[in-house]
């Protein structure tokens, strides 16, 4: 048993039909030691008397908020939550896997540039009675400060039957230089409470992997005179990490046919912008990728050929 | 990037071209020893990042784009002497800095080759003759060392009488390509943006 | 004191349908993951599916996705294994058993798929 | 399609100890906790070892496992009679947990 905050402990349990479970002491805080009684939750069935409580703790009927008490007056509670280790795999009944880049994806994150600011977001199908709790830093031995923000809901989709939520978080490094070169990961960590059960969920990476820059900006075309070739030409997103001489990007221009079975015509340039055909009723987009060092593109930035 | 690239002309900066192919080569390599050496600990969240130019160089601030100088986090700063001067500068004004920093990624490459050809005599000995560095990026390394020009003590390469752990020399290959390719794209970031100004 | 009492097996057709199932006992089974696992005559152990507590999840093995489908009825207490386009390869003791590392399996019922 | 590969076959004598190996890769048992299963003919596996070296409580305290990188072992020191079935290894890969991942079995036999 730890304690995740004030007053709320957490139960691991090896969890399995008809396993033992935990034996929990629970001490009132209080100084009286005498007439002391014990309740779980909004029941009034006395469970013990004393200044402790002693519990097995199996499944999620032992788990809740016990109260001491004294003469009707309450004088403390012990929120238990349980965190369920299913065959020596701590369970994960809260958060969907993603399944992007990998299997056992629960948190994914991004950053637009390498300021050491970053976004991290999750989906469950739950909608009530649900709380989330995140920590950051860099490294895990001797840990550096990354601040987070509260999460969020941030969307709400419906799948098939099921409701989806998301949820993201904002951090950002207290102390990032953009030129830096990592060699300790940023380490996310997220505490998830559904009711009565714990999770908890971690991601590692390097600000280097999760970059994706914004669309380019300002995409505009310029035709050729006497031809069907168009100049077309763009910005550096304004949230790319300056100086751009120095944070290169690369570009990918394509032009797409109205229909998605029509032939994609791509070119791939390091300038700001390119020549290209434009055919009626087409379409052309431009993204963006770090030059040096290959994490995301970023997503199309479109105009009409027409 | 096995794509369709139209590059610019690397101008009058002639490390610009060698760096950008330095990139390409270790970045092969790399690939090649992830596919390779796929049973052993090789990925980047496998490995241990070690910097074998830790407290030897100090590249990324004496690099450092003066827009960023402003940045105390950057700041954290060394004290480095180098020998000053290279032929990149040849065709420009150079402020010591500049200087500072090239001389800084000659070191760099030297102790990064001095590293690779001790671990290349070392893999040479497998039995399983498993994976050998690329002869290329030996070369391209080479170039680059030679456009930056700078004098300095040749390194010895260094030798080992007792028999090789070949299982930890791979994983020290990784370790050390995945390092070498983060320093490589900050070499290609420098020169970049030493050709822009 | 747990039990997992297994019904449904039988000879069949290729091409054909099956459904087990799997009775549970003794516990609280609506909060236990539970898994299908077969064992063809003279072969090893290979695991089928799997169905999380609340059936919220199910995975399969790459040989039966598509054709099984895991299921469970958490008021009847009862696994269940609905099998389709059934083949000679599906031949096999089918197992229930409990998710954890203690586990608990069923007796086994024999499928065996022949013309 | 087996990952966990384990020999067909041991043997002992009475008395003697047997070993049976069980070799995987970083994402299954490098990874992850291996348990072990006896199968006598006709019955179902019955569990041996559990998170790599516990005994549920009835297995008798002849049957020790370990762990040590991606391999694991089964030992039977003073092999006996009924101890002559199939053993199966068992663990996960972190890519497809929940799907379990057996080993090829092992048939030890007991001679004499």
């Known amino acids: 048993i730890w304690e995740l905050k004030k007053d709320v402990y957490v139960v691991e349990l090896d969890w399995y039909p008809d396993a033992p479970g935990e034996m929990v002491v629970l001490t009132c805080d209080t100084p009286e030691e005498d007439g002391i009684t014990w309740t779980l939750d909004q029941s009034s069935e006395v469970l013990g008397s004393g200044k402790t409580l002693t519990i097995q703790v199996k499944e999620f009927g032992d788990a809740g908020q016990y109260t001491c008490h004294k003469g009707g007056e309450v004088l403390s509670h012990s929120l238990l939550l349980l965190h369920k280790k299913e065959d020596g795999i701590w369970s994960t009944d809260i958060l969907k896997d993603q399944k992007e880049p990998k299997n056992k994806t629960f948190l994914r994150c991004e950053a637009k540039n390498y300021s050491g600011r970053f976004t991290c977001w999750w989906l469950t199908t739950i909608s009530t009675d649900l709380t989330f709790s995140v920590k950051s830093s860099r490294g895990s031995s001797d840990p550096q400060g990354v601040t987070c923000g509260a999460a969020t809901l941030s969307a709400e989709r419906v799948r098939g039957d099921n409701k989806e939520y998301e949820y993201s978080v904002e951090c950002q490094e207290d102390s990032a230089c953009p030129a830096a070169e990592e060699s300790l990961p940023i380490e996310v960590m997220v505490d998830a409470v559904h009711k009565l059960k714990y999770e908890n969920y971690t991601s590692s990476f390097f600000i280097r992997d999760i970059i994706k820059p914004d669309p380019p900006k300002n995409l505009q075309l310029k035709p050729l005179k006497n031809s069907r070739q168009v100049e077309v030409s763009w910005e550096y997103p304004d949230t790319w990490s300056t100086p751009h001489s120095y944070f290169s990007l690369t570009f990918c221009v394509q032009v797409q046919g109205k229909s998605k079975r029509e032939k994609k015509d791509r070119v791939f340039t390091d300038k700001t912008s390119a020549t290209v055909i434009c055919r009626k009723n087409a379409s052309i987009s431009v993204r963006a990728q770090d030059r040096y060092y290959s994490s995301s593109w970023s997503e199309w930035a479109s105009v009409p050929c027409s | 990037r096995n794509l369709p690239v139209a590059t610019p002309d690397p101008g009058m900066f002639p490390c610009l071209h060698h760096s950008q192919n330095l990139l390409r080569a270790v970045s092969n390599m790399l690939q090649k020893a992830r596919q390779t050496l796929e049973f052993y600990p090789c990925t980047s969240e496998e490995i241990d990042h070690e910097d074998i130019t830790k407290d030897k160089t100090s590249t990324v601030e004496a690099c450092l784009p003066l827009e960023l100088t402003k940045n105390e986090s950057c700041l954290n700063s060394r004290e480095t002497s180098f020998i000053t001067n290279g032929s990149c500068l040849a065709s420009r004004k150079t402020s010591f800095m500049m200087a500072l920093c090239l001389s800084s990624i000659y070191e760099d490459l030297k102790m990064y080759q001095v590293e690779f050809k001790t671990m290349n005599a070392k893999l040479l000995m497998d039995p399983k003759r498993q994976i050998f560095l690329d002869q290329n990026m030996l070369a391209v390394i080479d170039e680059l060392m030679q456009a930056l020009n700078f004098n300095s003590e040749t390194v010895p390469q260094k030798s080992s009488l007792e028999e090789p752990d070949f299982y930890k020399t791979k994983i020290k290959l990784c370790i050390l390509l995945h390092a070498f390719r983060i320093r490589a794209v900050t070499i290609d970031r420098v020169m970049s943006y030493l050709n822009a100004s | 004191q747990v039990q997992l009492v297994q019904s449904g097996g039988g000879v069949v057709q290729p091409g054909r349908s099956l459904r087990l199932s799997c009775a549970a006992s003794g516990f609280t089974f609506s909060s236990y993951g539970m898994h299908w696992v077969r064992q063809a005559p003279g072969k090893g152990l290979e695991w089928v599916a799997f169905i999380r507590y609340d059936g919220s999840n199910k995975y399969y093995a790459d040989s039966v996705k598509g054709r099984f489908t895991i299921s469970r009825d958490n008021s009847k207490n009862t696994l269940y294994l609905q099998m389709k386009s059934l083949r000679a390869e599906d031949t096999a003791v089918y197992y229930c058993?409990?998710?954890?590392?203690?586990?608990?399996w069923g007796q086994g019922t024999m499928v065996t798929v022949s013309s | 399609s087996y990952v966990l590969t384990q020999p067909p076959s041991v043997s002992g004598t009475p008395g003697q100890r047997v070993t049976i190996s069980c070799s995987g890769g970083r994402s299954n048992i490098g990874s992850n906790t291996v348990k072990w299963y006896q199968q006598l003919p006709g019955t179902a596996p019955k569990l041996l070892i559990y998170y790599n070296d516990q005994r549920p409580s009835g297995v008798p305290d002849r049957f020790s496992g370990s762990k040590s990188g991606t391999s694991a072992s089964l030992a039977i020191t003073g092999v006996q009679a009924e101890d002559e079935a199939d053993y199966y290894c068992?663990?996960?890969?972190?890519?497809?947990?929940?799907?379990?991942?057996f080993g090829t079995g092992t048939k030890v036999t007991v001679l004499g």
């Open positions: 068992q663990s996960y890969d972190r890519g497809t947990h929940p799907a379990l991942l």
């Open positions: 058993k409990t998710h954890g590392s203690h586990d608990n």
